[in-house]
């Protein structure tokens, strides 16, 4: 038969290689069948037989089409500062993210080491870049005409709504306050929105992490002023 | 003026429960992660416990095995530490503290900027 | 879990002198610790964050250095009220967490 219509196991043609989803068995010195995901070489071929699969066993997968003696053991469960987003199958490793509110701060080969809390942004300043899966928020202050008063991680820089009349001035922590006539949203300078992803807390936005293999954010309104750029009550 | 107000230490026997409170003034909990840090009489700093009000999850170190329980209070604007099954290695001054407020506009919750007075608890019988 | 060693654990010095103190963490986390002082009776007060980036409010004779697992707090001149203990901390508290602070260093008038 002609190499193209070969049946497994079969010689190459001098100087040929083996079709897809097979390879070349260096002992036999075959073209040998390769096998699918999920699946391993339990035996493998020689001159007169194929390549002999197996299902991989619990805990342990393969994700590609191979020849490989024993599947790779999926990575350990994910440790408390992160979450399963992809479980352990026969055909693909568990994958780990950091919670929804962290970001992972030391990466390792697969996945991430340690995930760490994002920062916010206090009121006066705005998200200039948001958090991702592998970094930290960055705040800006808010540019004239422009306000924050949340502590956030998610919260832009707004534009303050313009007054007809102007009962109180705004600034970069407080939004503009009108008399009774309606007020109107300007288009400050500085105002520019960040694009992000479909909102899945009340009107705030929350960056969505892609995934990893293996081990990424908030709000709401201070009480009075924002805790100050000072630490302790202790002394 | 902001500040948080630690209370609810005082004596119990081992085997015994305690609830501490952090109340906040000048910053709303709900933004704000906050931790329980203990020091025992004469050593050093130990985290306790942290929570995280925006997404509701809760931390522990290794060693509260249970038998603590942070939780908040949003409209009282209070934080408490349920302590159960308490030793006399549970001895020390409980602190509540909170992230970093920085000038340049940032508040970090991996550093701790703002802290309580603190409120003694002693393990004894 | 990440250990956090400190030394050393006291130390005496003179008002004027320039003082050092190291913490060591059990593996690497790049530049995020933080420094504080504590004095008897009183919470503990937030000196450096990011392993050298000065709090608010904190004089800038104190300074920190270093990244990965070695870490430095310098006193350039030391004044009367830095009589206290120093303590290192990492900015990773999980439920996987139980060392977050150095055992901390005491700085006593010699």
């Known amino acids: 038969l002609p190499a193209q219509v070969a049946f497994t196991p079969y010689a190459p043609e001098p100087g040929g290689t083996c079709r897809l989803r097979e390879y070349y068995d260096q002992t036999a010195q075959m073209c040998c069948s390769k096998c699918p995901p999920g699946q391993h070489a339990k035996v493998f071929c020689t001159k007169t037989s194929d390549t002999v699969c197996d299902s991989c066993e619990d805990s342990t997968y393969t994700q590609l089409w191979n020849w490989v003696p024993e599947c790779l053991s999926c990575g350990s469960r994910c440790s408390s500062d992160q979450v399963e987003t992809q479980a352990c199958t026969r055909e693909q490793n568990r994958i780990c993210t950091c919670r929804p509110g962290w970001y992972c701060a030391l990466s390792k080969q697969e996945g991430c080491r340690l995930c760490a809390q994002l920062r916010k942004c206090r009121p006066g300043f705005g998200v200039a870049r948001p958090g991702t899966e592998t970094s930290d928020v960055v705040c800006k202050p808010c540019a004239p005409g422009t306000f924050s008063n949340t502590t956030s991680s998610t919260d832009i820089c707004r534009p303050h709504q313009i007054c007809h009349v102007v009962a109180i001035p705004g600034n970069a922590s407080m939004d503009a306050v009108c008399t009774s006539t309606s007020p109107t949203r300007s288009m400050a300078p500085g105002a520019v929105h960040l694009p992000q992803p479909v909102s899945t807390r009340s009107q705030h936005t929350q960056p969505t992490p892609a995934p990893s293999t293996a081990p990424g954010t908030s709000f709401l309104l201070p009480v009075g002023p924002s805790p100050p750029a000072e630490g302790s009550t202790g002394d | 003026e902001v500040q948080l107000v630690e209370s609810g230490g005082g004596l119990v026997q081992p085997g015994g429960s305690l609830r501490l409170s952090c109340a906040a003034s000048g910053i709303d909990f709900s933004s704000y992660g906050i931790s329980w840090v203990r020091q025992a009489p004469g050593k050093g700093l130990e985290w306790v416990a942290y929570?995280?009000?925006?997404?509701?999850?809760?931390d522990y170190a290794t060693w509260v095995n249970g038998r603590f329980t942070i939780s908040l209070d949003n409209s009282k604007n209070t934080l408490y530490l349920q302590m159960n099954s308490l030793r006399a290695e549970d001895t020390a001054v409980y602190y509540c503290a909170s992230g970093y407020a920085s000038s340049s506009g940032y508040y970090d919750p991996k550093y701790f900027g703002l802290w309580g007075q603190g409120t003694l608890v002693t393990v004894s019988s | 879990d990440i250990q956090m060693t400190q030394s050393p654990s006291s130390l005496s010095a003179s008002v004027g002198d320039r003082v050092t103190i190291t913490c060591r963490a059990s593996e690497d986390i790049e530049s995020y610790l933080a420094w504080y002082q504590q004095k008897p009776g009183k919470a503990p007060k937030l000196l450096i964050y990011?392993?050298?980036d000065l709090a608010s409010g904190v004089p800038s004779r104190f300074s920190g250095s270093g990244s990965g697992t070695d870490f430095t707090l310098t006193i350039s001149s030391l004044q009367p009220e830095d009589f206290a203990t120093y303590y290192c901390?990492?900015?990773?508290?999980?439920?996987?967490?139980?060392?977050?602070f150095g055992g901390g260093t005491k700085v006593e008038i010699k």
């Open positions: 990011d392993a050298s």
């Open positions: 929570i995280y009000p925006d997404y509701g999850s809760t």
């Open positions: 901390q990492h900015g990773f508290y999980t439920s996987r967490s139980d060392s977050v």
